[in-house]
């Protein structure tokens, strides 16, 4: 008996977009986060608001291949990278182009993943090795989350479970997705 035959459907979007009460963490990568710091401005400015719903943040599209060892997805996957800046929604998209980007007064808000989508991916392997199926969970939208003095950045990286959350302050800082994510249909196929 071997493994079941793999469907060779390359990538297939799974229609459900679930809401997850504890979304997986997102690596805060300096290359993409571009966080605007206070820049010596006074803590108050005219656009300050207490309502998180009035804030929004930048969603940058990021395309990558899913790989596992020598195997690579037939097609790249696209997801969002949540930029580190949060500002009043009415200023965000248009003002950027005019160079009037709002600078937050201190680290009050972070832009973090909000919703995820699952996508089935077929990984193709060299040398006649059987394909591997994966499900990756990809960031589908971002949100602003208000920080309190008790938060630090790693505490925003809500994982599916506390026990499984990669540890704060440790080296490789995975951008862990609590996902059925790149699921392994691992190397062999029997």
């Amino acid at each position: 008996q071997g493994w079941q035959a793999f469907k060779n459907d390359a990538t297939e979007i799974i229609p459900e977009l679930g809401e997850y009460p504890e979304p997986p963490p997102e690596l805060e990568n300096n290359k993409t986060m571009n966080r605007a710091e206070n820049g010596g401005r006074p803590p108050h400015h005219p656009f300050e608001t207490k309502d998180v719903s009035e804030y929004s943040c930048r969603e940058l599209h990021f395309t990558r291949y899913v790989t596992d060892g020598p195997c690579r997805s037939a097609k790249p996957v696209t997801e969002l990278v949540c930029s580190g800046q949060c500002g009043p929604a009415r200023l965000l998209p248009n003002a950027i182009g005019r160079g009037k980007w709002w600078r937050p007064s201190g680290p009050d808000f972070r832009c973090i993943p909000d919703r995820y989508r699952a996508q089935r991916v077929q990984l193709l392997c060299p040398g006649g090795e059987a394909p591997r199926a994966r499900k990756v969970r990809l960031v589908a939208s971002c949100k602003c989350k208000r920080l309190t003095r008790f938060h630090n950045q790693s505490e925003l990286k809500d994982f599916g479970t506390e026990a499984a959350r990669p540890q704060k302050g440790r080296k490789p800082r995975p951008r862990a997705r609590s996902a059925k994510a790149n699921q392994a249909e691992l190397e062999n196929a029997y």
């Epitope: 596992d68 699952a118 199926a133 490789p172």
Partner: antibody, heavy 125, light 108 residues
């Protein structure tokens, strides 16, 4: 809280059939592969197999292929392990677990991040 | 299938002692495919180290993992009472997924 809740212990007769359940809370099982493991008394862990609740695709360790059947019911967010032809060898704790990944610096990792508390099956006449 | 051989099977360590548990793999695997779990009596295994060297949340920094190819290890820099448990390595390189037989670590 993200959890996998497993059904209670069972005492079963040799040759019988038993069906264990594993119900997920706070996440949709369709977004994760679910795996089952066996742990015999005072022994290590054996992987039984894996199911994709989204489409029912399964993989089994060949040594469990004829003994174990994995199914899911997405409407109740529950996975099932059915064991048939029970013998004393079947006496063990059975765990369900969720497969998750993380991606960092171009590398993907797959691992069991959430485990159920286990269901003890005792086969005895 | 890939066979994982853990050694020692049983060991005892005094508080403050350095502990190393090894996991030998029957064929070469990528380091991102080797994980460690901790299990205490009558409880389910807990994720402990992912991808050879990444500690799960809540795991004390006295734990570390290393290795590549066919040789991997888990190290406790300074043994504490709460570290007494059984540790399993597990590979995610190919199906069937396999675990080591476990190393039972006792407090001396």
């Amino acid at each position: 809280e993200v959890q996998l809740q497993q059904s209670g212990a069972e005492l079963v007769r040799p040759g019988a059939l038993v069906k264990l359940s594993c119900t997920a809370s706070d996440f949709n099982i369709k977004d994760f592969y679910l795996h089952w493991m066996r742990q015999r008394p005072e022994q290590g862990l054996d992987w039984i197999g894996r199911i994709d609740p989204e489409n029912g695709d399964t993989l089994y360790d060949p040594k469990f292929q004829d003994k174990a059947t994995l199914t899911t019911d997405t409407s109740s967010n529950t996975a099932y392990l059915q064991l048939s032809g029970l013998t004393s060898e079947t006496t063990a704790v059975y765990y369900c677990s969720r497969e998750a990944d993380y991606f960092h610096d171009g590398t993907s990792y797959w691992y069991f991040d959430v485990w159920g508390a286990g269901t003890t099956i005792t086969v005895s006449s | 299938e890939i066979v994982l051989t853990q050694s020692p099977a049983l060991m005892a360590a005094s508080p403050g002692e350095k502990v190393t548990i090894t996991c030998s793999v029957s064929s070469t695997i990528s380091s991102n495919h080797l994980h460690w779990f901790q299990q205490k009596s009558d409880t389910s295994p807990k994720p402990w180290i992912y991808g050879t060297s990444n500690l799960a949340s809540g795991v004390p920094v006295r734990f570390s993992g290393s290795g590549s190819g066919t040789s991997y290890s888990l190290t406790i820099s300074s043994m504490e009472a709460e570290d007494a448990a059984t540790y399993y390595c597990q590979q995610w390189s190919s199906y069937p997924l396999t675990f080591g037989a476990g190393t039972k670590l006792e407090l001396r």
